[in-house]
Amino acid sequence: MMTGTIETTGNISAKKGGSVILQCHLSSTMAQVTQVNWEQHDHSLLAIRNAELGWHIYPAFKDRVAPGPGLGLTLQSLTMNDTGEYFCTYHTYPDGTYRGRIFLEVLESSVAEHSARFQIP
């Protein structure tokens, strides 16, 4: 039985040219996280964080995506095209797969703020 829940940074905004942290957190389960996959709205893979094998960064993003913090992802040099949905897929044992959603809006405005519902140290 899957008892866990995924918390995410929810709907966030950041300014063009800036950076943003995409973060999910799995709670309420003792399941072991074996891998986290990060995908974009079109289901293209941004990155994989495997607990043992480390990080895979999709080549198209290698200059703009930084691993971490933690199981999260830092997306840099934002463009308007980065606006959209992002999904974190947690592969766990023995529970199975959990999925979280984040919506990122990239704003032209220099006063855009990146706000999150929670922070992970």
Epitope: Q35, H43, L53, G54, H56, I57, K62
Partner: antibody, heavy 119, light 107 residues
């Protein structure tokens, strides 16, 4: 030049164990994961598992059900794969391969080690 | 586990031919697919990754495409040194799995 040099061919009895070595050179050993892949005669490729020399983490293909152990000696930049409880169907060529940095693709491979299991 | 199914399992072609090999995943693997080339008695060599980036030194006649579940390796003009077996592999989730291989033979 990146090189992975494996130990020589082995002939083993059913029920015994084999330990294959893979000596890496030409790069910083701790910066790249080492994988093991095998190929039975005339067959395709089968991923056995990987070892991260940076923190010592290992991951295994569960079809081997605890029969495989991957280790490394950082001081000699050598990775090892031990397979126990050998049976005839374990007869294969065993390859070590390096994963590219921040990429789950195996960019350099050892020459292969033939393991024959026969009574 | 994710199954990777390659087709055809073998094909005969002539030098200069355009060759297409397909690989289908049993479930979504996004763009987490790699292609290898293997010649008899030799270790596999990395050709294409993610799934359209050529590895260092791989000739431009090799190209890869696809996303989701369907992937293609294309050799635009087959050369004598291209006669080999080609494997796709997914790394979307562990265990990493390979296709059964496609043997490209001389017609």
């Amino acid at each position: 030049e990146v090189q992975l040099v494996q130990s020589g061919a082995e002939v083993k009895k059913p029920g015994s164990s084999v330990k294959v070595s893979c000596k890496a050179s030409g790069y910083t050993f701790t910066e790249h994961v080492i994988h093991w892949v095998r190929q039975a005669p005339g067959q395709g490729l089968e991923w056995m598992g990987g070892f991260n020399p940076n923190h010592g983490g290992t991951i295994y293909n569960q079809i081997f059900r605890g029969r495989v152990t991957i280790t490394a000696d950082k001081s000699t930049s050598t990775a090892y794969m031990e397979l126990s409880s050998l049976r005839s169907e374990d007869t294969a060529v065993y390859y070590c391969a390096r994963a590219a940095k921040l990429l789950f693709a195996m960019d350099y491979w050892g020459q292969g080690t033939t393991v024959t299991v026969s009574s | 586990d994710i199954q990777m199914t390659q087709s055809p399992s073998s094909l005969s072609a002539s030098v200069g031919d355009r060759v297409t090999i397909t690989c289908r995943a049993s479930q979504h693997v996004s763009n987490a697919v790699v292609w290898y080339q293997q010649k008899p008695g030799k270790a596999p060599k990395l050709l294409i990754y993610s799934p359209s980036y050529r590895f260092t030194g791989v000739p431009s006649r090799f190209s890869g495409s696809g996303s989701g579940t369907d992937f293609t390796l294309t050799i635009s003009s087959l050369q004598p040194e291209d006669f080999a077996t080609y494997y796709c592999q997914q790394h979307y989730s562990t265990p990493w799995t390979f296709g059964g291989g496609t043997k490209v033979e001389i017609k």
